[in-house]
Structures are given as C-alpha cells and as structure tokens.
C-alpha cells in the first residue's frame, strides 16, 4: 500500500506569548511545529514515530493564521507519506516550539523551547474529506484539519489496491475510486483489451482489432460481414453459405451462366410471334399469319395465304390484295360461281352436287385435295405441327416431323435424356445438364466423353481435401473433387453446413 497523511495547520493563538514552562518569549514566540504520527496507542508514549514525522519552518510569532503553501518542507498541508496498508487507526502528536534561531531550519537550532502540545488518537478512514478540529489549553489554541489519501495509482479503503490507467496494447482503462478498472469507450474484457466491434458485426463471420471495426473472415463480405461470397465466376446466382452458386430463376450451369429462359431475357421473336424455350440459348418462334423468318421478322406477301379461290389470281396492293377471277366466278375471293354441275367444275375427281335448285353447286373432294373446286393439293404442314424446332415434311397422304437432336415423338414434343445414349466412355458418369451431357471421368481418362486416355493423372497428387473423391476427365489434365457432406470448394477445403449440389470443377 501507499498513501499520505495530510495535516493542515490553520490558526495558532498564543496571545500572551508564553512557553509551556510559564516563561514568556522575548520579543515573542517565534513558532514552528513538530509532528509525530504513529500507530494507535491508547496511551501515547514516547518512542519512534512509526508512521512518520515532519517539522515546519517558523510559521509566525505568537498568534497567526497559516494560509500560504510555504516552500520546502513547510508545505501546507504537511505531508506524511507511508508505504504500507493504512490500518484505519493512528496516534498524532503536534508540538508547538519557540526558536531563537534560523527561520527555515529551526529544528537544528539550540535553545528551542516547547510552547504547547496536543495528542490525537483515534480512527480515520481513507478519503478526500478533511476532518477539522480545534484544541485549547490555558495558553494556546490550535485549529487544524487532517485526512488520509492514497498515493497516485493506489486505491481502496486501505490504499492497498494498485491501479495505473493505461491506453495501450495491454489495456484501455481508467481506475475507479475503489481501484477497479473502468474500460475506455470501445473496449471490453477483464483488462479492457478486447475491442467492441462495429455494432451488428457478425459474431462468427467478422472480427476486429480496434473499436468500431468489422473485418470479414474468408468467404464473407459486407459492412457487417453477413453476406456470403459466391463461388468465383458465379454469374447469375447467389449463396447462403460461402462459395455456393445457387442459380437465379432462368439460369443454369455450374456458374449459372447458361440462359435457360432466352425468350424472357432477350425477346427474340418479333411481330407478335410466340417464343418457346428449348434448352440453353435455344428457342423457337411461332409466327402469326403473314410473317416468316427465324424471328418472324419477315412480312409475307398479302397473297401468300392464297386467298383467291376457284383459280383466281392474286395481286398485291398496299396493305391489301385483289383477286382476278376466272370466267364463271366472282366475289372478293372469287368464291361465287356462275357455273353449274353441267359445266363440270370439279377437278381431281371431285363429285359435283347441285344446290339451290341447280343455280349453284358444291364439290366433294377426294382425299388429299381441297378447295371449292378440289383444285388444291392438301399441305399438311401449314399448321406448324412440329414442336421444338422440328421440320415438317409432306409424305404423300401424310406428313412427318423431322426432330432436332435431343427431341423425339410424332410432333418432336418429347425431350430425350442426353445420358440415355450413354455418351460417356470408359465408365465415365453422365450428368444430364441443360446445355447437354457432362461426363465425369474415372482416373486416367479425360475429354468431353472420357474418350482420351491420359498418361498424367491429375488426381495422383491427391488434390482433394477432407476425404473427397477425385475424378478426372472434364478436359485434359483437369480434375473434379466430389465433396463429402459438410464441405465445399474446388478442393472441398471449406467446411459448411450443407452438401454441395454438384461436384466442383477444379
């Protein structure tokens, strides 16, 4: 422990200028004080001043008030330092002396005489509050105050608790009156050495080395480190754990860079035509009447739909057409006839039936012919019956659909699994993806279909971590790590809570 007993002498009155022995001072009592502080004694006895002692210079003659903080050892209040735990009790002896000698060091002068003395015994707690007292005898009066305070960096009831404020690597704190630590703003912990991170900084995914900071751990980003970083190269996807790439709607592939909804994203079909998606970046435009081309971008001739019947010839006009009817026919589309069955109007073996009491007729056409006079051969492809970009072909009385790769069925309406044809050689595993099959090859093979035998085995160096299975073969010298539950990453090096949906390609 360490502290200071402080004594403030306030006023001394010796109006008659008398010594303790009854003699008077000549010309007056030039007064200094001796103070002795010791352990508590029920009866004060001579002997060493165990807690310390101090003397003052001459402070005045006979009666005087002490207001200055005098220089040297005469500082007011007088200081009695101690280097032990304050016991809470004490004995104090204050003696007033007259000196005929030196003002500053009267203690050393011969012929000093006692004027009076007082003895105080009791208890005193450590604190800043002064205890004020006054002692009288027949000749003199002394008023004074005293207290015990702790030395710098010492605290507590007995000045035994050491605490030194600091603001460095080992702590950031001030000291409370009882010596306990009070952390500076932004710091916490037993020794106030733990920074308080930015409010909201994720407990697991972020950390800090100074207050109001938030440094992200690998795989996390954002001001509060609460946003995961998706797999490198992930284009149209998100993550819920680091290094994931969960595709947005309409996108596919390992990096979500394959457009599965080309129609919505790009609107390639023009002039009100209908767009149908057909695999990554694949689509088909179904045109409205009067339009043609891959994107229905070409406007057909107004006559293209053969609107003129009964052999009428069609002439294009601005925004319209005009039918030139053959003899015996009239009307906008040459649909009205002046002929009767007697004129044999039905072609291609069509049967003529009279109507309206013989004033008109109707032809009943044999199979594969149509038109009011059975003059047209039936085209079974006009209705665009083939789906998914299939080509329609007339085959005599019927028609067939020629399907694009990957589709089958009468109208090419069925999607064939690419893996159904077992495209992977040498025991490779086939994955049916939107843009075609992907093969993961066994060790020693590579290529799109595991058709290439490789001398260098990319898996030989054991590049996969955490018990993952290594495959080669997506392309020469490449390998794939198939991660066990709880790990992701190109080498299965990152622990997570969920299994990857597909092995990562290194």
């Amino acid at each position: 422990g360490s502290g200071i007993f402080q004594l403030r002498l306030q006023e001394f009155v010796n109006q008659r200028g008398m010594l303790a022995n009854g003699q008077s001072c000549e010309p007056g009592c030039r007064t200094f004080f001796r103070i002795c502080l010791k352990h508590f004694q029920a009866t004060f006895s001579e002997g060493p001043c165990t807690f310390g002692n101090v003397s003052t210079p001459v402070l005045g003659t006979n009666s005087f008030v002490v207001r200055d903080k005098n220089s040297g050892s005469g500082r007011n209040p007088l200081q009695l330092p101690f280097n032990f735990t304050w016991p809470g009790t004490f004995s104090l002896n204050i003696q007033a002396w007259h000196t005929p000698g030196d003002d500053l060091r009267p203690e050393t002068s011969p012929g000093n005489s006692l004027i009076s003395q007082i003895i105080i015994q009791g208890s005193l707690a450590v604190g800043k509050i002064w205890r004020t007292d006054e002692q009288n005898d027949t000749l003199t009066r002394l008023s004074y105050s005293y207290r015990v305070i702790c030395s710098d960096n010492y605290y507590g009831e007995s000045c035994s608790r050491l605490c030194k404020k600091r603001d460095d690597h080992f702590g950031h704190y001030e000291c409370q009156p009882d010596g306990s630590l009070s952390c500076l703003p932004g710091w916490t912990g037993k020794y106030c050495d733990q920074p308080i991170c930015l409010s909201g900084c994720h407990e697991q995914n972020g950390y800090c080395s100074k207050p109001d900071e938030c440094i992200c751990r690998p795989g996390w980003q954002g001001r509060l480190c609460n946003e995961c970083i998706p797999h490198n190269g992930c284009r149209h996807g998100t993550c819920s754990i680091p290094w994931q790439c969960a595709c947005d709607e309409g996108w596919g592939g390992l990096f979500c860079d394959q457009d599965l909804n080309y129609c919505t994203h790009h609107s390639p079909c023009k002039n009100g035509s209908t767009c149908s998606n057909s695999g990554p970046k694949g689509y088909t435009c179904t045109c409205l009447p009067g339009y043609t081309g891959e994107h229905c971008e070409l406007g057909l001739s107004k006559c293209a739909s053969n609107p003129c019947r009964n052999g009428g010839s069609c002439k294009d006009q601005e925004n319209s057409y005009h039918c030139l009817c053959p003899p015996g026919y009239y009307g906008q589309h040459c649909e009205h006839s002046t002929l009767t069955c007697a004129d044999s109007p039905c072609f291609n073996g069509g049967s003529c039936r009279e109507r309206n009491q013989g004033s008109s007729y109707a032809c009943e056409c044999p199979p594969n012919f149509t038109g009011s006079n059975c003059e047209k051969k039936v085209d079974r492809c006009t209705s665009n019956p083939c789906a998914n970009g299939g080509q329609c072909q007339n085959r005599g009385p019927s028609r067939t659909c020629r399907c694009r790769p990957g589709f089958t069925g009468t109208h090419c309406e069925l999607h064939i699994s690419d893996c159904a044809r077992s495209p992977c050689a040498h025991g490779g595993t086939c994955h049916d993806l939107e843009n075609g099959p992907v093969c993961t090859c066994p060790a020693g093979f590579s290529g799109r279909r595991c058709e290439v035998r490789i001398t260098h085995d990319a898996c030989a160096s054991g590049p996969c971590f955490n018990g993952a299975t290594c495959y080669t073969g997506l392309s020469p010298n490449n390998f794939v790590c198939n991660c066990p539950y709880g790990f992701v990453g190109s080498r299965c090096e990152f622990p997570v809570g969920l299994p990857p949906s597909f092995p990562w390609v290194a």
Epitope: S63, V65, W130, T132
Partner: antibody, heavy 121, light 104 residues
C-alpha cells in the same frame, strides 16, 4: 445549504463610519473550518479583499485599510460585522460578505448577494 | 504590497480553449483561487488550491500554478462562460485579488 445576507445603510456621508452586518443561516458561524470575510467592488472595477475573522475572534485585515477597519463576530446571533471609518467617495462600492473555507485553501465558496453602499453628502 | 496581474481581456470562439494568466512574485509558492463573475451577480469559486475544482463546476475548467504564473484554462468554451474572471492568493495573512480578465 449555508446562506449569507448583508444588511446596513445604502448611503453614508463622507467622513462617517460605514457599518454592515452579515447574517449566516443554514450553518454555524462557530465552525473551526471557516473564516468569515468582507470583499468590496467599486462600480465597474475589480474585487478588493477587506479582511476576515475567525469565530474565536482572530482578525486579519488588508494592510491598505488596516487603520480604518474593524471586523467583529457575534456567535450567539450567528453574525459578523464590518466597520469602515472616515469614508470617502472612493469607498463607494458593492460590499460582499463571504465564507472562506480553510479546507479549500482559503477559497471563498459562499457569498452574499452584495449590497451597494454609496458615500455621498 | 503584493500584486497580481491579469490581462484585461481574452477573446475565444465557442468550442475553442481560453487561457487566462495571473502573475505575481513567486506565485507558485502560494495557493491560488479563481472566481467567475457574471454581470449583476456575486462571484463564484471555480478553482481552489491551484487546480482543484469545487463540486458542481464543469470539468472544462482547470488550473495550474508554478513559478510566477498561475493559469486558468477553459477548454471547449461555451457561450455561458462569458464573464469576468479573478485570481486570488494569500500574501502572508492578507487576501489579494488580481485585476480581473473579461472573457468574450
């Protein structure tokens, strides 16, 4: 809380004696921790310490006023008084009574509100 | 007789620091008190024993005393601190006030 209140005439004729009393309430004037003092302030000027007294009777005065000043204490009434003789116009001032706390190094921690005394015929 | 000298005035912007000096022969050997006085009011003790603050006085008031000069410092000065400031010391048994400084 201790309060101090000055009282006395606001007008004094030149050459006469100025007399003021300070009444202490809310605490005892007989405390050994305090001196009871008088300070004055001429209009538009600074503060000037006049003197003080201990409850037991000890008095201390400004050397420049020592010959004209008397300060006394009446512990039974909890009052202390100032007498300034042979006044001139230069003694016109606001007079304050104050409590000087020895524990505060003699700092005056309580003041009266002050009373203006004009010296004029 | 003992004299304490203060500058007549000190100007400071709000939020800045104001320093008022008080000079006297070997003033560092004496205890210095500082008082604030606003127009029409009694003085208020703001610093005692060179650097101690009475209860109720804001922390922005601080004091120091060494050699021949004592200083009152007001850090982060506020509009309400505009006032006259007086230093005071004890010369033997008599009190002495400084001439006063107007802080604006």
């Amino acid at each position: 809380e201790v309060q101090l209140q000055e009282s006395g005439p606001g007008l004094v004729k030149p050459s006469e004696t100025l007399s003021l009393t300070c009444t202490v309430s809310g605490g005892s004037i007989s405390s050994s921790s305090y001196y009871w003092g008088w300070i004055r302030q001429p209009p538009g000027k600074g503060l000037e310490w006049i003197g003080d007294i201990y409850y037991a009777g000890s008095t201390y005065y400004n050397p420049s006023l020592k010959d004209r000043v008397t300060i006394s204490v009446d512990t039974s009434k909890n009052q202390f008084s100032l007498k300034l003789s042979s006044v001139t116009a230069a003694d016109t001032a606001v007079y304050y009574c104050a409590r000087e706390d020895m524990i505060l190094g003699g700092g005056a921690d309580n003041w009266g509100q002050g009373t203006l005394v004009t010296v004029s015929s | 007789s003992y004299e304490l000298t203060q500058p007549p005035s000190v100007s400071v912007s709000p939020g800045q620091t104001a320093s008022i000096t008080c000079s006297g022969d070997r003033l560092g050997d004496k205890y210095v008190s500082w008082y604030q006085q606003k127009p029409g009011q009694s003085p208020v003790l703001v610093i005692y024993e060179d650097s101690e603050r009475p209860s109720g006085i804001p922390e922005r008031f601080s004091g120091s005393n060494s050699g021949d000069t004592a200083t009152l410092t007001i850090s982060g000065t506020q509009a309400m601190d505009e006032a006259d400031y007086y230093c005071q010391a004890w010369d033997s048994e008599a009190g002495v006030f400084g001439s006063g400084t107007k802080v604006t």
